[in-house]
């Protein structure tokens, strides 16, 4: 299953939208920085596209869930959020099409499950951080920066997979 070229463009648009969502000067938020422990190895160790697609799907689904909460709606510009949802939704559809085609169904399911669980735990840590920080503007900015970084790392993986094949 080859992800369409539009998927790459969508990933870039998603990052652009995340950058545009900024609401406050970030320099005042340095003290709120936090180590969320992005499970980078779960993306780096998947050598076959078949193994990465469910993990990438989980990543985007979790981003969608995180920014779909009422707390998120209160934190960000509604127009930008709507565009952001649309981009994420399209990427989920692209990835689901590959999953439905049965890519990797018989290949190392346990490894995939472990990776998916690691991604879920990562987002649990992010959610807990926001809760502890009472969804402050700075906390949201730290999370936005973290999502930009982790999303960028995961989309770089997609690009390297595409170039390998």
């Amino acid at each position: 299953c080859d992800l369409p070229q539009t998927h790459s463009l969508g990933s870039r648009r998603t990052l652009m939208l995340l950058a545009q969502m900024r609401r406050i000067s970030l320099f005042s938020c340095l003290k709120d920085r936090h180590d969320f422990g992005f499970p980078q190895e779960e993306f780096g160790n998947q050598f076959q596209k078949a193994e990465t697609i469910p993990v990438l799907h989980e990543m985007i689904q979790q981003i969608f869930n995180l920014f779909s909460t009422k707390d998120s709606s209160a934190a960000w510009d509604e127009t930008l959020l709507d565009k952001f949802y649309t981009e994420l939704y399209q990427q989920l559809n692209d990835l689901e099409a590959c999953v439905i085609q049965g890519v990797g169904v018989t290949e190392t399911p346990l490894m995939k499950e472990d990776s998916i669980l690691a991604v879920r735990k990562y987002f649990q840590r992010i959610t807990l951080y926001l809760k502890e920080k009472k969804y402050s503007p700075c906390a949201w900015e730290v999370v936005r920066a973290e999502i930009m970084r982790s999303f960028s790392l995961s989309t770089n993986l997609q690009e390297s997979l595409r170039s390998k094949e």
């Epitope: 950058a19 900024r22 000067s25 970030l26 320099f27 005042s28 938020c29 340095l30 003290k31 709120d32 920085r33 936090h34 180590d35 969320f36 900015e141 730290v142 920066a145 973290e146 930009m148 970084r149 960028s152």
Partner: antibody, heavy 121, light 107 residues
Amino acid sequence: EVQLVQSGAEVKKPGESLKISCKGSGYSFTSYWIGWVRQMPGKGLEWMGIIDPSDSDTAYSPSFQGQVTISADKSISTAYLQWSSLKASDTAMYYCARHPGLNWAPDFDYWGQGTLVTVSS
Amino acid sequence: DIQMTQSPSSLSASVGDRVTITCRASQSINEFLNWYQQKPGKAPKLLIYFASSLQSGVPSRFSGSGSGTDFTLTISSLQPEDFATYYCQQSYSTPLTFGQGTKVEIK
């Protein structure tokens, strides 16, 4: 390979203007902030200010606010430090350095080689 | 502004010595403290970030500890290439501030 390359040494007269540069390569320029640090002859490091090249938002040390201007041109991955009217006391080595912003990553992990600015009549 | 105070301002030591430099912040900065090494005519080099994390490529004889207001840089066994000036720097809030430096000289 990550690199920050600064413009060459400058010799200026008091009252003249100056703009020095710091060009980033080997990484996504807009994903990191660029900080500027002054070191006067035989003295320690002084933080001057910082810029987020993604949108040119800046923060200055109160000591340098109004004395210098920090800017960036993301299309050419370059940050700038400028003076509208130099003073003899601006004579120093100026360094740029990369900062990860709000990400949990090493601060000022890469530095430029420095630009020596000499102001003398 | 947060003031950073290093001590001592200079010290003399021999190769193989254990060297300790301290840095005190005027208010709590959690773990947002970095250590840099600078040699004459060169740009500073990051050694330790977030108080105790060793920067990639830095020898393991360098270590950092502390949180809140009191921090320490330790060189477990001083090597000839370690004679330099060391600076602490807080990244808890702007303006970011450096300590005044500690010069490590040969005894």
